[in-house]
Interface confidence: low
């Protein structure tokens, strides 16, 4: 008996070849002996089976002695033994229909679990192997699970079902819904405009949801919602925004926020959450703001930074084109009685300058100028 594997929803062609290369009387029936399809001369006749509206045959091939049975929109319950009787010949084909589906949706939030479930006909004992877009192989029986989906899991998963030394391949497109970056940090001098961008790592035709940016300023005891917004078909509309700071938001994707000016009281960490329509859970991106201020008060030149800095960051004060006068892994440095000239305050990481602020120190009879 010939075995043919089919995929749920697909179309399958079961072949039946007569020894005589001409159109002769034939019919197909199932294991229940119910007629499915046959011919009346050069015309097709359909039997009373429940497949009635989903079966066909290639009439153009009858003259060559080929009597195919085409079953469209395959269902698991179509799995059966199909018998072709042509002239005095009889051919049997065992059709096994499999389905592979993602647990709920193929659009999953980062960190969620993906469960692939194999639907198979009774009496079959298939094995399944899936390969993720990043080349990771997983094996299983009726179900395969991948926990903690990552961004790299987005793409086409290729799954092979093996049964009776035959195989059928499924391709499932999985979209992991996440921001491109889990976290970002913006370094700004006091007074500068701040741009926060939250690019998504996926594209969908219609994107609807709502979001909010919560901000924990370093100086504040509790976090505060800075802005809430809606997203409808990739168009952004602001619902509510604080008066201080008054953030502005771009109307198109990627999500883009502008803080008119960086001030020490705004330095801190934010968490942008995006809840997508019909999805449980939220997308998150952390954003950090580090603000630098260089000031001269009487005989003291001070440089300070506010916000989430790593302990390995170095804060330095130096006179232009000279060695650093002071360099510390701290959030404030100062020089007493600084000599006149252009001073630079530098925040650096392993020699790479992240933020720089210049302040001109005038001879002692003048007041300082901040460029």
């Amino acid at each position: 008996k010939k075995v043919v594997l089919g995929k749920k929803g697909d179309t399958v062609e079961l072949t039946c070849t007569a020894s005589q290369k001409k159109s002769i009387q034939f019919h197909w029936k199932n294991s229940n002996q119910t007629k499915i399809l046959g011919n009346q001369g050069s015309f097709l006749t359909k039997g009373p089976s429940k497949l009635n509206d989903r079966v066909d045959s290639r009439r153009s091939l009858w003259d060559q002695g080929n009597f195919t049975l085409i079953i469209k929109n395959l269902k698991i319950e179509d799995s059966d033994t199909y018998i072709c009787e042509v002239g005095d010949q009889k051919e049997e084909v065992q059709l096994l229909v499999f389905g592979l589906t993602a647990n709920s949706d193929t659009h999953l939030l980062q960190g969620q679990s993906l469960t692939l479930t194999l639907e198979s006909p009774p009496g079959s004992s298939p094995s399944v192997q899936c390969r993720s877009p990043r080349g990771k192989n997983i094996q299983g029986g009726k179900t395969l699970s991948v926990s903690q989906l990552e961004l790299q899991d987005s793409g086409t998963w290729t799954c092979t079902v093996l049964q009776n030394q035959k195989k059928v391949e499924f391709k499932i497109d999985i979209v992991v819904l996440a921001f491109q970056k889990a976290s970002s940090i913006v370094y700004k001098k006091e007074g500068e405009q701040v741009e926060f961008s939250f690019p998504l790592a996926f594209t969908v035709e219609k994107l609807t949801g709502s979001g909010e940016l919560w901000w924990q300023a370093e100086r504040a005891s509790s976090s505060k919602s800075w802005i809430t917004f809606d997203l409808k078909n990739k168009e952004v509309s602001v619902k509510r925004v604080t008066q201080d700071p008054k953030l502005q938001m771009g109307k198109k994707l990627p999500l883009h926020l502008t803080l008119p000016q960086a001030l020490p009281q705004y330095a801190g960490s934010g968490n942008l959450t995006l809840a997508l329509e019909a999805k449980t859970g939220k997308l998150h991106q952390e954003v950090n703001l580090v603000v630098m201020r260089a000031t001269q008060l009487q005989k003291n030149l001070t440089c300070e930074v506010w916000g989430p800095t790593s302990p390995k960051l170095m804060l330095s004060l130096k006179l232009e084109n000279k060695e650093a006068k002071v360099s510390k892994r701290e959030k404030a440095v100062w020089v007493l009685n600084p000599e006149a000239g252009m001073w630079q305050c530098l925040l650096s990481d392993s020699g790479q300058v992240l933020l720089e602020s210049n302040i001109k120190v005038l001879p002692t009879w003048s007041t300082p100028v901040q460029p």
């Epitope: 409808k232 078909n233 990739k234 168009e235 109307k251 198109k252």
Partner: antibody, heavy 118, light 111 residues
Amino acid sequence: QVQLVQSGAEVKKPGASVKVSCKASGYTFTAYVISWVRQAPGQGLEWMGEIYPGSGSSYYNEKFKGRVTMTRDTSTSTVYMELSSLRSEDTAVYYCARSGDGSRFVYWGQGTLVTVSS
Amino acid sequence: DIVMTQSPDSLAVSLGERATINCKASQSVDYDGDSYMNWYQQKPGQPPKLLIYVASNLESGVPDRFSGSGSGTDFTLTISSLQAEDVAVYYCQQSLQDPPTFGGGTKVEIK
């Protein structure tokens, strides 16, 4: 203030097409969705579809798919609704309506009567 | 599509009396704690005017004698004290699911 001004009444023969315009003013044209809603004489209201003036993307009620086309001209802040293969049952007042915070239909045009008659 | 059924078709109420209009959706129009139901008033020869949005929120400029209530599938528009200028046709409309659908309308007259 927000204003939606529609083109004048039209009389069409069955099988013809009609194109109704809706000129928006008093707000940022690209910021709000504009819908088209029709009302047959003495009947209720029926949503035909909507257009996003920013992108030009439009979404239609299944009932009108294949017969309705919604377009926009950002240079004149005007939205157009074209209905083809007109039949007598398309005789109605056609309204454009702009969305707001609470609803899809906050601001309405004055309506355009389209009469389909042989 | 969600089917909206309004009752009654018409209503005659004395000036100063309460008028109540009901609307039933074929399926729930609730989402995330809100009911996506709006109410409109339409006078002859005029476009509809939004009165109530999201079941119970009064649109700006609408007199507070109008109120909306309900959730899930059953909603009510109430005019607490009918005025002469309230004579109109009132429509409910769901905005949860495309296509947005309207009720058949309720004509309010003075008794």
